[in-house]
Interface confidence: medium
Amino acid sequence: LPAQVAFTPYAPEPGSTCRLREYYDQTAQMCCSKCSPGQHAKVFCTKTSDTVCDSCEDSTYTQLWNWVPECLSCGSRCSSDQVETQACTREQNRICTCRPGWYCALSKQEGCRLCAPLRKCRPGFGVARPGTETSDVVCKPCAPGTFSNTTSSTDICRPHQICNVVAIPGNASMDAVCTSTSPTRSMAPGAVHLPQPVSTRSQHTQPTPEPSTAPSTSFLLPMGPSPPAEGSTGDHHHHHHHHHH
């Protein structure tokens, strides 16, 4: 005969774990249902009744299957120098990133506290290291034989064109001028642009849980020795630490 399917809540066999999308409730000592993303546990299970889930309130979310007593608060509204690249919904947090041409000058775990415009390299200087979401552009003087005639946060130093006959020699901020009508170049003409940094998620990451047999003690849920964590069975919990400079 096929094994009977157990319905939550049920007592697990000794040494076994609860199934996917279930968690072990220490108080009831039963395997109980988790709540789906966008919901939270309104009433915890007992020996005779399963978890009662409820939708997250406005400006709160849960991203994973969970048994948290309250949903997580979405991060602060984005500041004027940021763009909201992901809206706050019942299932996901708001994500703010610095607007194009800017980078994060000061950040904490909560996200970017202050955006700053990317440095522009003036004529005679080119981009040595492009800006990223969290670091500024690094400029360098154009080496002999190269130039940049722009003020830009993306242009690198380009080689002077090679003339048959030079009318005006090039310098760090100006290309060579040829008298010949057919100059040659060691690389294609036109400004060379470095790609703009690609924004990555910078705000409020959720902790991932321990296996359901050992509920985590996430800092998000300061409520006793074994509070519930979000996520599915078998994930590992990432503790967030603030790194001192």
Epitope: S73, L106, H204, L221, P222
Partner: antibody, heavy 120, light 111 residues
Framework: QVQLQQSGAELARPGTSVKLSCKAS????????IDWVKQRTGQGLEWIGE????????YYNEKFKGKATLTADKSSSTAYMQLSSLTSEDSAVYFC?????????????WGQGTSVTVSS | DIVLTQSPASLAVSLGQRATISCRAS??????????MHWYQQIPGQPPKLLIY???NLESGIPARFSGSGARTDFTLTIDPVGAVDVATYYC?????????FGGGTKLEIE
């Protein structure tokens, strides 16, 4: 307008604990940090740490780790600081202050302070 | 930790004159063109009050006689002209990195 209302003065015995509160109003409590600052009589200001109530994340001055524990209750918009294993060195006025996540990066609104006296 | 050294420790200025308070950091508090240095006023028996944020920005509601300047490691708070209501202790504070630190304070008196 932004207001931070702190709990009343505390008189405590050495070795015991006290829990100070700071009730915020006039802004979205979960959007900004609450900082705690210590000031001994006639002395300067010392940063203890801060909490981001939206997530419960805390940042401590190493000097106060193990001494101060910061928590926040979103439902009542109240931040708490528990001081444990009190000694005479903990006798001071403790201020809570708001620090916006964005912009100023400074403590722009302060509570009135809570005086803690540790005496046997 | 970033150490902030204020000078002078106390200062006596005549009404209507200029008061200048200095704050020196043990390392730069600048990042990307921003100086994470702030100035507070504390009147006895009251909590500190933010005057200047990020080196030179005047906090809302603070009189224009208060101004801040400086960059990297050297910062100045100027009160010009000094009024009787300005008798207080003034603190600088950095928020570039944890732990945030304060200067030792400068006590301003009227002579």
């Amino acid at each position: 307008q932004v207001q931070l209302q702190q709990s009343g003065a505390e008189l405590a015995r050495p070795g015991t604990s006290v829990k100070l509160s700071c009730k915020a109003s006039g802004y979205t409590f979960t959007d900004d940090y609450i900082d705690w600052v210590k000031q001994r009589t006639g002395q300067g200001l010392e940063w203890i740490g801060e909490i981001y109530p939206g997530s419960g994340n805390t940042y401590y001055n190493e000097k106060f780790k193990g001494k101060a524990t910061l928590t926040a209750d979103k439902s009542s918009s109240t931040a708490y600081m528990q001081l444990s294993s009190l000694t005479s060195e903990d006798s001071a006025v403790y201020f809570c202050a708001r620090s916006q996540v964005y912009g100023k990066i400074a403590m722009d609104h302060w509570g009135q302070g809570t005086s803690v006296t540790v005496s046997s | 930790d970033i150490v902030l050294t204020q000078s002078p420790a106390s200062l006596a200025v005549s009404l209507g004159q200029r008061a200048t308070i200095s704050c020196r950091a043990s390392e730069s508090v600048d990042n990307s063109g921003n100086s994470f240095m702030h100035w507070y006023q504390q009147i006895p028996g009251q909590p500190p009050k933010l005057l200047i944020y990020r080196a030179s920005n005047l906090e809302s509601g603070i009189p224009a006689r208060f101004s801040g300047s400086g960059a990297r490691t050297d910062f100045t708070l100027t009160i010009d002209p000094v009024g009787a209501v300005d008798v207080a202790t003034y603190y600088c504070q950095q928020s570039k990195e944890d732990p945030y630190t304060f200067g030792g304070g400068t006590k301003l008196e009227i002579e």
